[in-house]
Structures are given as C-alpha cells and as structure tokens.
C-alpha cells in the first residue's frame, strides 16, 4: 500500500484546512491509527492528533477544539483531519504516520501554506496646489503573506514607486503615486489596486484628487457700452473666476465707497437706476485659501443729453 496526500495545502487565514492522508492499501489491510504531528525543521515534532480505529480522534491539548475529522461518511482508510480556523502560526510542515495491519507503518509530509489577505490603506499626500512640481498624491500600503501586488488605476498622468518591507511571516508593500498638479486633475479618481492570491477579487481604494488653484478674474457686464446710461435699470457687473476650493468674491470701488443702493450679491454687483454718481472704478477681489486675484473696470455712465461717446476701460490685475 501507499499513502496519498498533497505536497502543499493552501488555505486563507481563518478558513479550515483539510490535511489529507489516505492509505491506498491492498484488500484486507486495515488502518489501526493515524498520528498527525507538526514537524517544522529545527523543532521537535509536536503532536496534533491521533485517529484511532477504535477510540476515535484524540486531539493534543495545544490543538484542543481546532482539530476534527471530516464530516461523515468516512472511509476507515482515510486519516485526513480538519484544522479549524487556520492562523499564520499554523504555516509549516505536517506529517501523518499511519499504522496498518499487516503492512506496518507509512508516513508522508505536507506543507501547510496560510495565505494572509492584505487590508490595504490609502494615505493622501500633502495638499496639491497648481504650480507645484512633482508631488506625492497618495501612498497605498498593503501587508500580507505572500507579499501583495500594489498598482494604480487612474486617467491622471503620474509616476509610481514601490518599496517592500519583509517581516517574519509577511511582507508590507507601499506604492506611491507622484504627479505634477494641474487644475484639470480636480475631481479625478486615483485608485489603488491590491492583488493577492488570498483575495477572490482585487481590492480597490479610490481617492478623489483635489488640486488647489485660482483662475484669473474678469468682469462681465460692460460689453455693450451704450447700455450704461442715466436711468437704466437692472445694470449689473459679474465677476468671473473659478478655483478650488471655490473662491469668495468681494466688490469695492477704488475711488471711494460703493454708492448707496448698489447691492453686492456674491460675484454680482447690482445697480439701482443709473446716475452719474455710479461712474467710477470698480474692483472685484477673488480669493480662496490658495490665492487671490483682482480685476477692475471703469464704469462711465452716459448722459443721453450729451453727444460725446462713452469711454470704458478694462484693466485686469493679479
């Protein structure tokens, strides 16, 4: 007869490992007992369990509650056992020793490999600002056994670098994603993808990029100069800009206080029926945590009684 087993049994952390040991004997041969032991190199054999043909399963105290026979029906020649809730420390060499009648004793070894799936973590880098050079956008770390694979999935152009740290029973892999920040990257997903044989599917962690910027400011509302005449209602100036974080707006008049009746509503400056008092230089001040911008315009309210044309100057300043 001979023993049938596996060279390697692979199980995921927390799952049950079946340690196979089947005696393929000639007719009339019987298995008296099967002894299972852990036999890692450099250490003495540690008994797991004994499967006795009459007495049943005896589990050594160190493995109490963790070793069982596979569920029925059971073949009397089958000495396989289940190791419940495999932990990383269970990884190693195991031996089954089968005592048969009348053929004598047989033994076989197998290696138990316990896969430890990673629990990845993504850490965003420092705040991204337009105008910076190559900057860390995010780092992704995953530790497992064997070492996991860490890659990135994104439409954003950038560079990656990886490093690995080996521990006694696992390895930690860290991958960094660097980029040159630009406003076009705002809101773009940056996804860390972790692959590992202990995972049914890749694990993905997505980080949304936020790049701080502030666009140049400009003012609209003076495109048709002829509309800015005495008595006109509903005249308004609108300040145009964009940024991340979203900017706030402030209106001032360069040559004095804002005239009475002029309403400030965020990016919009609303005028009452126009008078010559509304003529002047108006400044839109745009700011966020990243930067600030100014844009100024000169309003010249036209008196229709006069023949002279209206002059409008547009000046932008940063």
């Amino acid at each position: 007869g001979e023993l049938e087993t596996s060279d390697v049994v692979t199980v995921v952390l927390g799952q049950d490992a079946k340690l196979p040991c089947f005696y393929r004997g000639d007719s009339g041969e019987q298995v008296g007992q099967v002894a299972w032991a852990r036999v890692d190199a450099g250490e003495g054999a540690q008994e797991l369990a004994l499967l006795h043909s009459k007495y049943g399963l005896h589990v050594s105290p160190a493995y109490e509650g963790r070793v069982e026979q596979p569920p029925p029906p059971r073949n009397p020649l089958d000495g396989s056992v289940l190791l419940r809730n495999a932990v990383q420390a269970d990884e190693g060499e195991y031996e089954c020793r089968v005592s048969t009648f009348p053929a004598g004793s047989f033994q076989a070894r197998l290696r138990l490999r316990v896969l430890v799936p990673p629990l990845p973590s993504l850490n965003p880098g420092p705040a991204l600002e337009e105008g910076q050079g190559l900057t860390l956008a995010a780092s992704c770390t995953a530790e497992g056994s064997p070492a996991p694979s860490v890659t990135w999935d994104t439409e954003v152009k950038g560079t990656t670098s990886s490093r690995s740290f080996k521990h006694s029973r696992s390895a930690a892999v860290t991958s960094e994603f660097h980029l040159v920040p630009s406003r076009s990257m705002n809101g773009q997903p940056l996804t860390c993808v972790v692959s590992h044989p202990g995972l049914l599917q890749d694990q993905r962690i997505t980080h949304i990029l936020h790049v701080s910027f502030l666009a140049e400011a400009s003012v609209r509302g003076l495109e048709d100069q002829n509309l800015w005449h005495i008595g006109r209602e509903g005249a308004m100036l609108k300040c145009l800009s964009e940024g991340q974080p979203p900017p706030s707006y402030n209106w001032t008049r360069l040559d004095g206080p804002l005239p009475s009746g002029v309403r400030v509503d965020g990016d919009t400056l609303g005028f009452p029926p126009l008078t010559t008092e509304h003529s002047g230089i108006y400044v839109c001040h745009v700011s966020n945590e990243f930067s600030s911008r100014d844009s100024q315009v000169t309003v010249d309210v036209l008196d229709p009684q006069e023949d002279s044309g209206k002059q409008v100057d547009l000046v932008s300043a940063s």
Epitope: K54, Y55, G56, L57, H58
Partner: antibody, heavy 122, light 107 residues
C-alpha cells in the same frame, strides 16, 4: 496469567511516609505503562499517578503532586509509590493497575491488583 | 479536568431486567471511555473499552455505546452476579477521571 500484588500499606501518622510496592507477573512488565488508583472508604475511584514504560515520564493528580513519587524497576517487575507528607485525606485502598497501551492519554486499565489499605491517622 | 457525571447514582432492579446507566463528559472525549465493574472488597474489573468494545471474557449481555460526551452502559438481562457498582472513566486527557459510580442493587 496476569497478576498484580500490592504491598506496603498500613497505619501512618499525618506527615509520615510510606512506600507501596506492586509486584507484576504474567506479562512483559517493561512494555506497559502502569498507574496507581485509590479509593477512600465508601467513596469512588480516584486516579493518583501514572508512569510510562521507559521510566522517564510520569504524571500525577493535583492532590498528590509534590508529595508522591511513582517509580518502577523493570528488572524486578515492580512498581512503586513513595508517599510523603501524608494527610488524613490520603486514607484509601491503593490499587496498582496496568494500562492497555503505553500512551500518554492512558487508554484503559485492564488488570488491577487486589489493593492495599493506607490509613493516615494520629 | 474533565468531569464525568453518572446517572443514576443507584438503582434497584430484578434478575432478567434490562438496565441502562448513562455517563456524561464535561467536554468531548471521542470514544476514550471505559466502563468498570466493582464488587464490595474487590478490585475494579474492565468491562468495556473504547466506549463500545467488549473486553475479552466479559459476557455479551454487557454493551456500551456513545461518542463525544454522552455514553451508555447496558446490561440486557441482569444476572445475580451483576449486582455491583459500575464506574465510567475517561482517558482522553490527563488526569483520567472516573464517574462517581452507579450502585445496582437487588429489588
């Protein structure tokens, strides 16, 4: 025929010592683990100690650990139990018994001696 | 330590009766269980080993069953010489432990 004969029992004062012997015959004594089991008057059975065939490994009940020592002389086919610091609660009939197999978790006790009475009293 | 609990602690029966004694272990012991018979002034005698195997020379009216935590000793037809005290014993772990005994008396 397998035979186990205990001797050495008797009356002893608390704190005293006794040495019990068990002479074995009818089987290859050196191949078997042996145990001592006691029975207090009118009470049930209590395992006391076990020694394996090689005389290099022994186990004791918590109640006697540090006071009793089991030993064997395979050349004389004899099992011993040295009992020190005896207490009143050690009063019992002491049986020696053969284990069916030489294994650490005991197996069964298939042959027993007739017992020897140990009385601890002042 | 594993606790062994026998029931009943005593019973009265007549010759020819079927007698059942149960033994419960405080944790699973597979089939590492023996049954012993003890008569007054005598040493215990092994009846059943491995929970259900009959020791050589023991009458076939004695039988054992069970595995894990619950075990039974059955005497199919009680004979006069069967009036005695019966003990179960586990040897799954050290220390081996005995049940408190079941005394079978004549009714």
């Amino acid at each position: 025929e397998v035979q186990l004969v205990e001797s050495g029992g008797g009356l002893v004062q608390p704190g005293g010592s006794l040495r019990l012997s068990c002479a074995a015959s009818g089987f290859n004594f050196g191949d078997f683990a042996m145990s001592w089991v006691r029975q207090a008057p009118g009470k049930g059975l209590e395992w006391v100690s076990r020694i394996y065939s090689g005389d290099d490994n022994a186990s004791y009940a918590d109640s006697v650990k540090g006071r009793f020592t089991i030993s064997r002389d395979n050349s004389k086919n004899t099992l011993y139990l040295q009992m020190n610091s005896l207490r009143a609660e050690d009063t019992a009939v002491y049986y020696c018994a053969r284990q069916t197999e030489d294994r650490s978790y005991g197996y069964d006790l298939d042959y027993w001696g007739q017992g020897t009475l140990v009385t601890v009293s002042s | 330590d594993i606790q062994m609990t026998q029931s009943p602690s005593s019973l009265s029966a007549s010759v020819g009766d079927r007698v059942t004694i149960t033994c419960r272990a405080s944790q699973g012991i597979s089939s590492y269980l023996a049954w012993y018979q003890q008569k007054p002034g005598k040493a215990p005698k092994l009846l059943i080993y491995a929970a259900s195997s009959l020791q050589s020379g023991v009458p076939s009216r004695f039988s054992g069953s069970g595995s894990g935590t619950d075990f039974t000793l059955t005497i199919s037809s009680l004979q006069p010489e069967d009036f005695a005290t019966y003990y179960c014993q586990q040897h799954y772990t050290t220390p081996p432990t005995f049940g408190q005994g079941t005394k079978v008396e004549i009714k």
